[in-house]
């Protein structure tokens, strides 16, 4: 998959890093009417490598069914893949007016917590 | 539920905070054989109140099905409820030897990322 020398898809999908996708402006939930698409960057992927002794024990307890988490609130047994820096997103609304929303798109990611 | 004046159970389960449970040492995944139970503290709960503009748009995109996450790697649209401080846990193994494992239990939580 991909051109010669491209990475296997599974490996590319796994680790915590910056992703980018074309999304409809109207789905950003900003309240602006627009028919355009804009590039949106976000963070996803695993942070398993960054787990602490606490995380390893928490994962073990959850796996063994020895911990009863509060309803609807399962604890997280690894740091979270989250943005560490942001950038503005600009787009054109239906009135052909350019709008800019600060700190809407991620520009860097890290395993936090 | 709870005594007079206590908050409803659902509200108590909701926000990010420190939880505490009695767990079997053998389920901690430490490799020590023990028949003891210890108090294990961990963090869980929602961090929705701490969401950034990025998080709100990410949640909107995911809700609208407008974002196609990498396989097996859904992005997180709120900070994570994670330990900010830890403490050691001590227990007796089957040979009646006291063992101490540093930074195994949480002592404080926060919405990180």
């Amino acid at each position: 998959a991909g051109g010669p020398g491209s990475r296997p898809r599974a490996a590319g999908a796994r680790g915590c890093r910056l992703r980018s996708q074309l999304v409809p402006v109207r789905a950003l939930g900003l309240g602006h009417r627009s028919d355009e698409l804009v590039r949106f960057r976000f963070c996803s992927g695993s942070c398993r490598r960054a787990r602490s002794p606490h995380d390893l024990s928490l994962a073990s307890l959850l796996g063994a069914g020895a911990l009863r988490p509060p309803p609807g609130s399962r604890p997280i047994s690894q740091p979270c893949c989250r943005p560490t820096r942001y950038e503005a997103v600009s787009f054109m609304d239906v009135n052909s007016t350019w709008r800019t929303v600060d700190r809407l798109s991620a520009t860097a990611c890290g395993c936090l917590g | 539920a709870g005594g007079p004046g206590s908050r409803p159970r659902a509200a108590g389960a909701r926000g990010c905070r420190l939880r505490s449970q009695l767990v079997p040492v053998r389920a901690l995944g430490l490799g020590h054989r023990s028949d003891e139970l210890v108090r294990f503290r961990f963090c869980s709960g929602s961090c929705r109140r701490a969401r950034s503009p990025h998080d709100l748009s990410l949640a909107s995109l995911l809700g609208a099905g407008a974002l196609r996450p990498p396989p097996g790697s859904r992005p997180i649209s709120q900070p994570c409820c994670r330990p900010t401080r830890y403490e050691a846990v001590s227990f007796m193994d089957v040979n009646s030897t006291w063992r101490t494992v540093d930074r195994l239990s949480a002592t404080a939580c926060g919405c990180l990322g």
């Epitope: 998959a1 051109g3 999908a13 996708q21 074309l22 804009v38 503005a88 798109s105 | 196609r68 990498p70």
Partner: antibody, heavy 123, light 107 residues
Framework: QVQLVESGGGVVQPGRSLRLSCEAS????????LHWVRQAPGKGLEWVAF????????YYPKSVKGRFSISRDNSKNTLYLQMNSLRAEDTAVYHC????????????????WGQGTLVTVSS | DIQMTQSPSSLSASVGDRVTITCRAS??????LNWYQQKPGKAPKLLIY???GLQSGVPSRFSGRGSGTDFTLAISSLQPEDFATYYC?????????FGPGTKVDIK
């Protein structure tokens, strides 16, 4: 190796329709967003349609919106462009292109292009 | 729409020359700027992706830089096979517009 082969071009009268196809091979078709780009004789490049890897998103510039329709069949590794109400200004070589990166990492850079199929709209 | 302008529209250069082509966007496009090379009768070829990424198989004499609205493509030492037309393209905001092209020919 990656190959994109367009077909379906030809001479057509104004107001008529044409359907272009692009057969893809050498990559996992359903992992990539795809585009059509055209080039009028002696002119520059003009982007005409986008479709997401799963077909959930499509987009067209104003010049073709309402007349052109992009679609894909991931089971056949084929991309299509249905062109209706054709005009003289639609005369161009039409290229099928794939994005360089997987759909979840897409930056919009187009790393493979078909050789193109010529569409001539003339009475 | 985001308008893309390129300068110069054409240039004459000799083998071994350093060549720089400029591309300007009418609105910020962050770093979503790509460069393509096209030879007569051929399909365009991706050279540089997202401002500065060198596409696999492209010689290292090609480089890109810039941010926001102003971008450049540089060829450090022009080779005979580099005589072609070069297009920039923004892929940040729909519609994804191309610059009008810069034709590089032999002096």
């Amino acid at each position: 190796q990656v190959q994109l082969v367009e077909s379906g071009g030809g001479v057509v009268q104004p107001g008529r329709s044409l359907r272009l196809s692009c057969e893809a091979s050498g990559f996992t078709f359903s992992d990539y967003d795809l585009h059509w780009v055209r080039q009028a004789p002696g002119k520059g490049l003009e982007w005409v349609a986008f479709i997401s890897n799963d077909g959930s998103n499509e987009y067209y510039p104003k010049s073709v919106k309402g007349r052109f329709s992009i679609s894909r069949d991931n089971s056949k590794n084929t991309l299509y462009l249905q062109m209706n109400s054709l005009r003289a200004e639609d005369t161009a070589v039409y290229h099928c292109t794939k994005e360089r990166d997987y759909y979840y990492d897409s930056s919009g850079s187009l790393d493979y292009w078909g050789q193109g199929t010529l569409v001539t709209v003339s009475s | 729409d985001i308008q893309m302008t390129q300068s110069p529209s054409s240039l004459s250069a000799s083998v071994g020359d350093r060549v720089t082509i400029t591309c300007r966007a009418s609105q910020t496009i962050n770093n979503y700027l790509n460069w393509y090379q096209q030879k007569p009768g051929k399909a365009p070829k991706l050279l540089i992706y997202t401002t500065s990424g060198l596409q696999s198989g492209v010689p290292s004499r090609f480089s890109g830089r810039g941010s926001g609205t102003d971008f450049t493509l540089a060829i450090s030492s022009l080779q005979p096979e580099d005589f072609a037309t070069y297009y920039c393209q923004q892929s940040y905001h729909s519609p994804f517009t191309f610059g009008p092209g810069t034709k590089v020919d032999i002096k």
